[in-house]
């Protein structure tokens, strides 16, 4: 059955303050947690694409701390950027919960599609209250399968992501170890639409410089308008917001020559809301490539950086889980995807037809190592990071 | 390298229906559109249609609607044009043309259909 | 459907001369206009597209110009390797139109 359907859809939130959402508690938390995990990612190779989903992987591992305990428990909220000491655990749940919520809306016009598969071996008795929660408050089911058959269980876990991603997402998981009892699959996958569109008549093939030595081809979107773009002196960067129809904004960072690390070094929470607050628009020729970009990772490599390491260690306590038997997680795979192309609503070009001003406008080109941020505007929260090095890169 | 690769030939027998197909190489096939082009000897070029690859997004020549249906398949970065109810008005050379946009920029080496019972 | 009518259909020309292909869209296209290059029994090849621009590996003796309904290609010094057929193509509305070739032969 699909993850986020009815349960989506049930969750009743009346009783909370509406001005002030819980999930505005924990969006600075994920916000961090997001450039924490990117920096991480970032210091292991600087010739690589990056690209996650902070929320996707938050929300993963704060339903899997509902089935952990002690120091395991601990080590996955702080991980995720929580300090217990400042906000209730209830609290982190109900934010997640609501987050959820608010991203997978039946109305909403974003094209966003996620999920949480967690599978277990089969024979383990899991305990009911793990379940009832990963379904209430994280729209997520728990499966079991038999390990035993690594093929047969690898094609369950790939069904069911590919089902969830209506065929977009196929072979997530690659191999699984024989001695895998515990494996848990999160997915993300979004090709919006933007506010305002790119006409592709106008998209041309352009040289986008990798580094001081390799150039690739790659199709340029361009657009003579008006954005919501400026030249920051502290980030040493152009900052473009860009609004995609359904609450989500992009907002894409280029930095100035040398100075990508230090744009990621100053990335924070603040200046990421101060830019957000900004509705200022002035006229910019855009260069910008399209994209289809993707992200595969094995969390525990990724997250044993951030300090979450027990949980997929023997000594894990996941008695939350199951009572029956000592169980660690044994593989944690995060893929998440993404198109950027020139599509808005049908004939939306027409619609925004807008005066330029006479001065000339800079010309702003994408054509070398840029970072993105993608925010869904109800909750402020991270819903993708990136950094493009190489747009051609499989 | 970019690569656009087409069976040379193709031997049909009219009314039956026949699918062509283009494998990409060398570039990333969901970020570019697939266009199909028709020339019959002596009489220039035509335009059948275009493809989007991400989403399958479409836009015929009316003239071929009812003639060309346009497919892709992204696991094997390929393209197809199934051609339907031949008739010997339909023997010709059919290019797969890749665009970033609007512009064709890069040429398959052609199909030759023939359709002959 | 926007019609486009290149002219002439055919040119002989000797080397080294300067030779020039027009093509005329039924309306305004907006300079979405590419030329292709057919030798006999080849595939097209993309020369110029957005009516001036060269593509990568394009000779420099080639250029194109023109806006609005009326544009022009331009062999500045006709080369042995230029004989062919040239094509002009409209992007600006759907259905894409192409001209009726300009078959380029050597005195």
């Known amino acids: 059955e699909d993850p986020q359907g009815d349960a989506a859809q049930k969750t009743d939130t009346s009783h909370h303050d509406q001005d002030h959402p819980t999930f505005n508690k924990i969006t600075p938390n994920l916000a961090e947690f997001a450039f924490s995990l990117y920096r991480q990612l970032a210091h292991q190779s600087n010739s690589t694409n990056i690209f996650f989903s902070p929320v996707s992987i938050a929300t993963a591992f704060a339903m899997l701390s509902l089935g952990t305990k002690a120091d395991t428990h601990d080590e996955i909220l702080e991980g995720l950027n929580f300090n217990l000491t400042e906000i209730p655990e209830a609290q982190i749940h109900e934010g997640f919960q609501e987050l959820l919520r608010t991203l997978n809306q039946p109305d909403s016009q974003l094209q966003l599609t996620t999920g949480n598969g967690l599978f277990l071996s089969e024979g383990l008795k899991l305990v009911d209250k793990f379940l009832e929660d990963v379904k209430k408050l994280y729209h997520s089911e728990a499966f079991t399968v038999n390990f035993g058959d690594t093929e047969e269980a690898k094609k369950q876990i790939n069904d069911y992501v590919e089902k969830g991603t209506q065929g977009k997402i196929v072979d997530l998981v690659k191999e699984l170890d024989r001695d895998t009892v515990f494996a848990l699959v999160n997915y993300i996958f979004f090709k919006g639409k933007w506010e305002r569109p790119f006409e592709v008549k106008d998209t041309e093939e352009e040289d986008f410089h990798v580094d001081q030595v390799t150039t690739v081809k790659v199709p340029m979107m361009k657009r003579l308008g008006m954005f919501n773009i400026q030249h920051c002196k502290k980030l040493s960067s152009w900052v473009l917001l860009m609004k995609y129809l359904g609450n989500a904004t992009a907002i894409f960072f280029l930095p100035d020559e040398g100075k990508l690390q230090h744009l990621e070094n100053e990335l924070t929470h603040d200046i990421i809301t101060k830019f957000l607050e900004n509705e200022d628009r002035r006229s910019a020729s855009l260069h910008l490539p399209k994209l289809s970009i993707t992200g595969t990772y094995d969390l525990k490599s990724v997250l044993g950086q951030l300090g979450i390491t027990k949980v997929f260690s023997n000594g894990a306590d996941l008695s939350g889980v199951t009572e029956e038997a000592p169980l660690k997680l044994s593989k944690a795979v995060h893929k998440a995807v993404l198109t950027i192309d020139e599509k808005g609503t049908e004939a939306a070009g027409a619609m925004f037809l807008e005066a330029i001003p006479m001065s000339i406008p800079p010309e702003v080109k994408f054509n070398k190592p840029f970072v993105f941020l993608m925010i869904e505007q109800n909750t402020k929260s991270p819903l993708f990071m990136g950094k493009v090095v190489n747009p051609t890169q499989k | 390298q970019v690569q656009l690769q087409q069976p040379g030939a193709e031997l049909v027998k009219p009314g039956a229906p026949v699918k062509l197909s283009c494998k990409a190489s060398?570039?990333?096939?969901?970020?570019?559109?697939m266009n199909w082009v028709k020339q019959r000897p002596g009489r220039g070029l035509e335009w059948i249609g275009k493809?989007?690859?991400?989403?399958?997004?479409?836009h015929y020549n009316q003239k071929f609607k009812d003639k060309a249906t346009l497919t892709v398949d992204k696991s094997s970065s390929t393209a197809f044009i199934q051609l339907s109810s031949l008739t010997s008005e339909d023997s010709a050379v059919y290019y797969c043309?890749?665009?970033?946009?609007?512009?064709?920029?890069?040429w398959g080496q052609g199909t030759t259909l023939t359709v002959s019972s | 459907d926007i019609t486009m009518t290149q002219s002439p259909s055919s040119i002989y020309a000797s080397l080294g001369k300067r030779v020039t292909i027009t093509c005329k869209a039924s309306?305004?296209?907006?300079?979405?206009l590419s030329w292709f290059q057919q030798k006999p029994g080849k595939s097209p090849k993309t020369l110029i597209y957005?009516?001036?621009r060269l593509v990568d590996g394009v000779p420099s003796r080639f250029s194109g110009s023109g806006s609005g309904q009326d544009y022009s290609l331009t062999i500045s010094s006709l080369e042995y390797e230029d004989m062919g057929i040239y094509y002009c193509?409209?992007?600006?509305?759907?259905?894409?139109?192409f001209g009726g070739g300009t078959k380029l032969e050597i005195k």
């Open positions: 043309v890749r665009s970033p946009g609007g512009y064709p920029d890069w």
């Open positions: 060398g570039y990333i096939f969901t970020s570019y559109w």
């Open positions: 493809i989007d690859p991400s989403d399958s997004e479409t």
């Open positions: 309306q305004d296209i907006n300079s979405y």
């Open positions: 957005r009516a001036n």
């Open positions: 193509l409209q992007y600006d509305e759907f259905p894409y139109t």
